[in-house]
């Protein structure tokens, strides 16, 4: 008897459910009479879920756990396991007894997210340069454990004087502090990244300190870290500013923002006016903030084509620029589904269902699945187009042999956005034509 | 009076380092971005890096992008520029410069640097 | 980058003559452009910036013009002391702060 399950760990994440796979070979004339299924801890062999004498013996488990019925007579003897905890971690193991038996472990990676950093200073007022300050990171409620690291504004580590420590709460839970302990410079961003390891996911913040100081004239430039995400046909601020020195004024100023690959102008200020936009009369700069150190630039009406990074080059007697991205995104229609063939459908015959989302950006990612959530990938085939726009419309056509009764989803998701569009179709055992006629 | 001097000059073989200094006087030098421009021997002027006068921001020229790196001691008053991987095509007379408004207002006397084998 | 085209590469003036030497930007520089003369084995030294700005100490027979794409330097006057060779750079924008080629002025 062949057992199989995945080789990698599953990911779920705290409070979510997660499926965890096992598949077994029936042989010819299988009855589930004879089936024997018991899902148990490796390390401690405790019971989980059985299925035994025909039936489903239920959730040994906080009543957390099932099985997927239906699919068993098929060899499918994978096991849901609801609201995921973080003791929930380990490893599990679906062995299965028909005449022959066999056994596999999978593992279970529980993981939660970690908050958006918050950063304190202490001493948080009066400072100037050759001062110590001590800059805490805090990011709550994640697992498994963080990674905490630190960085200056140039990106370059800072590893000297750093104390991070992790506590976890009553739900296994991980709460991360770290302090950095630095002398400031004439002014510095100090940056604090809180990565989980198993999600990839990074969260991060920064503070910029600049201590009072006597004006030397040098320009500090300073643009989000994060991309500027805005949405096709709206107007989007890609933000930027420096710091003029006393007695600045706009005659001095040269402002330049460039595409930041072709270097090709986008606008433009010298001679002390506005030079106007170089880029399809379709930026703008906020002139009444100039003189206060705002060189932003207004996008309107964003397009796709518009994708990418702005850099921002301020020079009066000192320079200096920063680079700002620019992440275009439109949202997905929500699905439609026809199916193939519509009408007079039986068990046993193979019908192409397909769903179709429209005009978003960038491009999607499509999931399907059966009515228990479980993730269909056969005979699954996506072809997404971008139209003159650059706007993806997207087809995802699956090919399934029905079964009694069945309902199937299509899921598409805009990565960017993390927003989901998803629509359905049910398909009844009875001789039946889709749509359903009234 | 603005004062700047280069050195750190000399014979170097293909492939090899030098760091070139300029020390700065009579201005205060944190206030002002600054330059480094070369003279290849009967040829003209060539920009080849600037950083800023706090030292956040420093540009090249691409032909020396990843083999030069400008920097520079706002405590010390000094401008450097080291240069690695040296080529023949280096071989020039190379002046510090200070940025006045959008100009080069200041220029050292220059140091030399030859680079054969 | 900015490309700086300077003409012409050499001329030979006398004492006295009205010299001009101009230079063309590839694209508009608007005004941010410097003069500069060389004497052999000397460095540089400035005498126009902002495209029309005489330097400190610069005799006023020099004069520098022009906006957008073109610019010019006029020497009014020529005096013994001004056969050097000229050169014109751009300032704007995100480096590279591009020369021209340069113009050697020569004693007919």
């Known amino acids: 008897l062949e057992v199989q399950v995945p080789e990698d760990p599953v990911v779920a994440l705290v409070g979510t459910d997660a499926t965890l796979c096992c598949s077994f070979s029936p042989e010819p004339g299988f009855s589930l009479a004879q089936l024997n299924l018991i899902w148990q801890l490796t390390d401690t062999k405790q019971l989980v879920h059985s299925f035994a004498e025909g039936q489903d013996q239920g959730s040994a488990y906080a009543n957390r756990t099932a099985l997927f019925p239906d699919l068993l007579a098929q060899g499918n003897a994978s096991l849901r396991l609801q609201r995921v905890r973080v003791a929930d971690e380990g490893s599990f193991t679906c062995f299965v007894s028909i005449r022959d038996f066999g056994s596999a472990a999978v593992s279970l990676q529980v993981a939660a997210p970690y908050s958006k950093p918050s950063m304190t200073l202490e001493p948080n007022k009066d400072l100037r340069p050759g001062d110590t300050v001590t800059i805490t990171c805090s990011s709550y409620q994640g697992y498994p454990e963080a990674e905490v690291f630190w960085q200056d504004g140039q990106g370059v580590p800072l590893t000297g004087n750093v104390t991070t420590s992790q506590m976890a709460n009553e739900q296994g839970l991980f709460d991360v502090h770290s302090i950095l302990r630095v002398v400031l410079g004439a002014n510095g961003t100090y940056s604090c990244l809180v990565r989980n390891p198993v999600l990839q996911q990074d969260a991060h913040s920064s503070v910029t300190i600049t201590p009072q100081r006597s004006p030397t004239g040098a320009v500090e430039v300073q643009v989000p870290e994060d991309p500027v995400v805005a949405l096709v046909g709206t107007d989007a601020t890609l933000r930027c500013s420096f710091s003029p020195e006393p007695g600045f004024s706009l005659a001095q100023l040269n402002l330049i923002w460039q595409l930041t690959d072709t270097k090709q102008l986008v606008h433009s200020f010298t001679e002390g006016r506005d030079q106007g936009s170089a880029y399809a009369n379709r930026t703008a700069l906020f002139p009444d903030l100039l003189a206060q150190g705002n060189a932003s630039l207004r996008l309107q009406r964003v397009r796709v084509a518009d994708e990418g990074s702005f850099t921002c080059f301020v020079s009066i007697r000192d320079f200096g620029s920063a680079a700002v991205s620019l992440q275009v995104a439109a949202p997905y229609s929500k699905p439609s589904m026809t199916l193939e063939p519509n009408k007079d459908l039986r068990p046993g015959d193979t019908v192409t269902i397909t769903c179709s989302s429209y005009r978003g950006y960038p491009e999607a990612e499509v999931f399907w699945q059966d009515g228990q959530g479980v993730p269909l990938t056969g005979n699954v085939t996506t072809s997404q187009m971008a139209n003159e726009q650059g706007l993806f419309d997207v087809h995802s056509v699956l090919r399934v042999v029905l079964g009694a009764n069945g309902t199937y989803s299509c899921l598409v998701r805009n990565p960017v956005l993390q927003q989901d569009a998803h629509g359905s179709v049910t398909i009844t055992g009875q001789p039946m034509t889709f749509p359903p006629e009234a | 009076e603005v004062q700047l001097v280069e050195s750190g000059g000399g014979l170097v073989k293909p492939g090899g380092s030098l760091r070139l200094s300029c020390a700065a006087s009579g201005f205060t030098f944190s206030s002002y971005g600054m330059s480094w421009v070369r003279q290849a021997p009967g040829k003209g002027l060539e920009w080849v890096a600037a950083i800023s006068g706090g030292g956040n921001y420093t540009y090249y020229l691409d032909s020396v992008k990843g083999r030069f790196t400008i920097s520079r001691d706002n405590a010390k008053n000094s401008l450097y520029l080291q240069m690695n991987s040296l080529r023949a095509e280096d071989t020039a007379v190379y002046y510090c410069a200070r940025q006045g408004l959008r100009v080069m207002d200041n220029w050292g006397q220059g140091t030399s640097v030859t680079v054969s084998s | 980058d900015i490309v700086m085209t300077q003409s012409p590469s050499s001329l030979s003036a006398s004492v006295g003559d009205r010299v001009t030497i101009t230079c063309r930007a590839s694209e508009n520089i608007y005004s941010n452009l410097a003069w500069y003369q060389q004497k052999p084995g000397k460095a540089p030294k400035l005498l126009v910036y902002?495209?029309?700005n005489l330097a400190d100490g610069v005799p006023s027979r020099f004069s520098g013009s022009g906006s957008g794409t073109d610019y010019t330097l006029t020497i009014s006057s020529l005096q013994p002391e001004d056969f050097a060779t000229y050169y014109c750079?751009?300032?704007?924008?995100?480096?590279?702060?591009?020369f021209g080629g340069g113009t050697k002025l020569e004693i007919k």
């Open positions: 902002a495209a029309t």
């Open positions: 750079q751009h300032f704007w924008g995100i480096p590279p702060w591009t």
